[in-house]
């Protein structure tokens, strides 16, 4: 009964134009905008995608990135998508949780590169890494794509268990690790014994 | 442009079997996990099977209705998506969409169906 | 699994007015401080088109008058004002738990 799926791009960051943004092409828009079409409606100025969003084209992407690999990408990081590390974290998990921020599988010799927080993936959007999500976020996989998902706060349910799995994928739904200064324990129940559910904790 | 096109679907008749095809193109098609979904006349949609992309290990699953008589495959190399459905029941006719997810985990690209009819 | 149930079955309204759909789910669909509500649009002979993913964003070039709002079990996707090309039967789908489900649609009309 499981979906799962693997998605490495992100989410583009396009709003419907006003009336009177009607366009025939990139060239009709302002800077930062690029002409949108649509099957079966008219096309109109859309704004421009950032570091990490797809593309199809170049005209797409915001002042200062391109597209390579169908991803907007930074003119100073231009390596393909696909030699990018995912690290290590579409295998099982005993826990079923993510680590954060989860930078320590990153391979040598490949250097983080460090974006704008405004080009960092949002809740839901999807990600490679928990570097491309924003503060207080991880990238972890939920169905057929990782996406950056909250870092746990205290009292939240950090074992697996705290979510209903199953017998086909058990790990189709990973949690965020906590987050800074809390660790995932054995939550100590009125009469001082351990329950099977454990939560984020202050250290 | 993103592009998912379908093909293969036809009347076959209860027990029988048929083979959907859907071509892909625009993006880089072995990195993305890619579904079909079937929408019987006149009622909603029904998700019938995954494949996920290379960095899931291209996994298969199904929903309990089809699973068993369905399998879903895929040639990275041809950019094509493929669902074999066998031990077909009247039940089984729909338009079937192949999907993907492109840019958020959501169905975001669709293509625009093919039309399968089981029908003695 | 999880039940989506919508309402109304049918909403008739003219271009320009608002349009308020709504989408219950037998469970929560919230986790991991996310709501996996995400809402499609299709017209008569076409595929579905997604809207609004985690039950608020807009999916890639979804023009502004579409929104999403609600948490838990209860969503709404709001239309601010209907423009003739939004008559068309709208779905919505979770992706919480499997198997991911959709529910029946409402169909927007032109009334």
């Known amino acids: 009964l499981v979906l799962d799926f693997n998605n490495i791009k992100s989410s583009a960051d396009v709003q419907g134009a006003g009336k009177g943004s009607l366009c025939a092409s990139d060239r009709d828009c302002s800077e930062g905008k690029f002409c949108l079409a649509f099957h079966d409606e008219r096309s109109f100025c859309a704004t421009c995608r950032r570091v990490r969003r797809r593309c199809q084209r170049s005209a797409v992407c915001c002042p200062g990135t391109v597209c390579v690999n169908d991803v907007c990408t930074a003119v100073e990081d231009t390596r393909p998508v696909m030699d990018r590390n995912t690290d290590g974290q579409d295998g099982a998990y005993a826990e079923g949780t993510t680590k954060w921020p989860a930078e320590e599988n990153r391979p040598q010799g490949k250097p983080s590169t460090k974006k704008s927080q405004s080009s960092k993936g949002q809740e839901g959007e999807s990600c490679l890494r928990t570097s491309d999500c924003g503060p207080g976020l991880c990238c972890a996989r939920h169905f057929w794509t990782k996406i950056c998902k909250p870092v746990l706060r205290e009292g939240q349910v950090c074992s697996r268990r705290g979510h209903k799995d199953t017998a086909q994928a058990p790990e189709i739904f990973q949690r965020c690790d906590c987050g800074p200064g809390l660790t995932c324990r054995s939550q100590v129940t009125s009469n001082r014994q351990h329950s099977r559910l454990r939560v984020c904790q202050r250290i | 442009e993103v592009q998912l096109v379908e093909s293969g679907g036809g009347l076959v008749q209860p027990g029988g079997s048929l083979r959907l095809s859907c071509a892909a193109s625009?993006?880089?098609?072995?990195?993305?996990?890619i579904s079909w979904v079937r929408q019987a006349p006149g009622k909603g949609l029904e998700w019938v099977a995954s494949v996920s992309g290379t960095g899931l290990g291209f996994q298969t699953y199904y929903p309990d209705s089809v699973k068993g008589r369905f399998t879903i495959s895929r040639d990275n190399a041809k950019n094509s998506l493929y669902l074999q459905m066998n031990s077909l029941r009247a039940e089984d006719t729909a338009v079937y969409y192949c999907?993907?997810?492109?840019?958020?985990?959501?169905?975001?690209?669709w293509g625009q169906g093919t039309t399968v009819t089981v029908s003695s | 699994e999880i039940v989506l149930t919508q309402s109304p079955a049918t909403l008739s309204l003219s271009p320009g007015e608002r349009a308020t759909l709504s989408c219950r789910a037998s469970e929560s669909v919230d986790d991991f401080g996310i709501s996996f509500i995400n809402w499609y649009q299709q017209k008569p002979g076409q595929a579905p088109r997604l809207l609004i993913y985690?039950?608020?964003k807009q999916g890639s070039g979804i023009p502004a008058r579409f929104s999403g709002s609600g948490s838990g079990t209860d969503f709404t996707l709001t239309i601010s004002s209907l423009e003739p090309e939004d008559f068309a039967v709208y779905y919505c789908q979770q992706l919480k738990e499997v198997p991911p489900t959709f529910g029946g649609g409402t169909k927007v009309e032109i009334k």
């Open positions: 625009g993006f880089t098609f072995s990195s993305y996990a």
């Open positions: 985690a039950g608020s």
């Open positions: 999907a993907t997810s492109l840019e958020n985990y959501a169905f975001d690209y």
